[in-house]
């Protein structure tokens, strides 16, 4: 049976060109954690496997760096960025845990006074 | 000024499919998400999930995948939503409405779909 | 998904009086950034939901100065200091910090 739960970052609003940490965390399961996908739709972004480490795709190794821990960093935003980001946790032998995280990347323009700006 | 103009109330018959529109003017189509909002028979609001119009890409509350399909023409900043294999839980008005920061600013007038034999 | 609760489901008033909505969420609606998306709108008989509050407190605009709201993590509340009679019909609050997003239940502002 399947106990774990999957818990997020939540969504984020940032502006363009900034950077943001997408991260997840899977609490209550003793289950291994074997692999953790990191994908925006139907691409993969990245993987960290438990023994061969990071893999980042190579379309995004410009602008995506592995981590903090099983996280995801996101630089130089673009509005094309803006979707649904899941993380992936392939586990023993529970089986696949899956969290959901909306980025909002918005113009300098429109950006809310809470939206997150950072250099990269 | 923004404004969401939807199309016109529908009568479907149960199993059948339809598409519903949401013309948006007065800003920058591409800029903010669109985000769709189930009422049925007055009662509770329901997030169906959002497009962004920018890239096309979708999120969706999964109680409607599969139910719901998002689409955009940017061409002519419309947003679209196709409801599939329609019975009659799926009577309800169902609302498009601009997002930004998480929240849902501007609202389109609402389309009102039964579905009945 | 986050189940968010509403309070009162019913609320009679009378014009001039000062009203609060609660809103509680099954899990802290704050982000790994301090950002909290939770909304607030008011949707009246024969049109279309309207957005009062984004953020927690901030109001949009053209709402009135009559309409606050507050609260953190799970928490929140929707004041109305002095109720006009444009002010009746439903209100919702709105999660958007985790996916899916979710409303309340609403609350019926009604005259007594």
């Known amino acids: 049976m399947m106990t774990g739960t999957i818990e997020t970052t939540g969504n984020i609003s940032a502006e363009k060109g900034g950077s943001i940490i997408l991260q997840c965390h899977l609490s209550s399961t003793t289950a291994q954690v074997t692999q953790v996908n990191w994908e925006q739709q139907d691409q993969l972004l990245a993987i960290c496997n438990a023994d061969l480490g990071w893999h980042i795709s190579p379309s995004f190794k410009d602008r995506v760096a592995p981590g903090p821990g099983l996280g995801l960093t996101l630089q130089s935003l673009t509005v094309n960025d803006t979707g649904e980001y899941f993380c992936i946790y392939h586990t023993y032998p529970d089986g696949t845990y899956t969290g959901r995280i909306f980025l909002e990347v918005l113009e300098s323009s429109v950006a809310e006074h809470g939206a997150r700006f950072q250099i990269p | 000024e923004v404004q969401l103009q939807q199309s016109g109330p529908e009568l479907v018959k149960p199993g059948a499919s339809m598409k519903m529109s949401c013309k948006a003017s007065?800003?920058?189509?591409?800029?903010?998400?669109m985000s769709w909002v189930k009422q049925s028979h007055g009662k509770n609001l329901e997030w169906i999930g959002l497009i962004n119009p920018y890239n096309g890409g979708t999120s969706y509350n999964q109680k409607f995948k599969g139910k719901a399909t998002l689409t955009v023409d940017k061409s002519s900043s419309t947003a679209y939503m196709e409801l599939l294999s329609l019975t009659s839980e799926d009577s309800a008005v169902y609302y498009c409405a601009r997002s930004r920061s998480f929240a849902m600013d501007y609202w389109g007038q609402g389309t009102s779909v039964t579905v009945s034999s | 998904d986050v189940v968010v609760t509403q309070t009162p489901l019913s609320l009679p008033v009378s014009f001039g009086d000062q009203v609060s909505i609660s809103c509680r969420s099954s899990q802290s609606l704050a982000n790994s950034y301090g950002d909290t998306y939770l909304s607030w709108y008011l949707h009246k008989p024969g049109q279309s939901p309207q957005l009062l509050i984004y953020?927690?407190?901030n109001r949009f605009s053209g709402v009135p100065d009559r309409f606050s709201g507050s609260g953190s993590g799970t928490d929140f509340t929707l004041k109305i200091s002095t109720i006009k009679p444009e002010d009746l019909g439903m209100y919702y609050c709105?999660?958007?910090?985790?996916?899916?997003?979710?409303f309340g239940g609403g609350t019926k502002l009604e005259i007594k």
């Open positions: 953020g927690i407190s």
């Open positions: 007065g800003y920058s189509f591409t800029t903010y998400t």
């Open positions: 709105l999660q958007g910090t985790h996916q899916p997003w979710t």
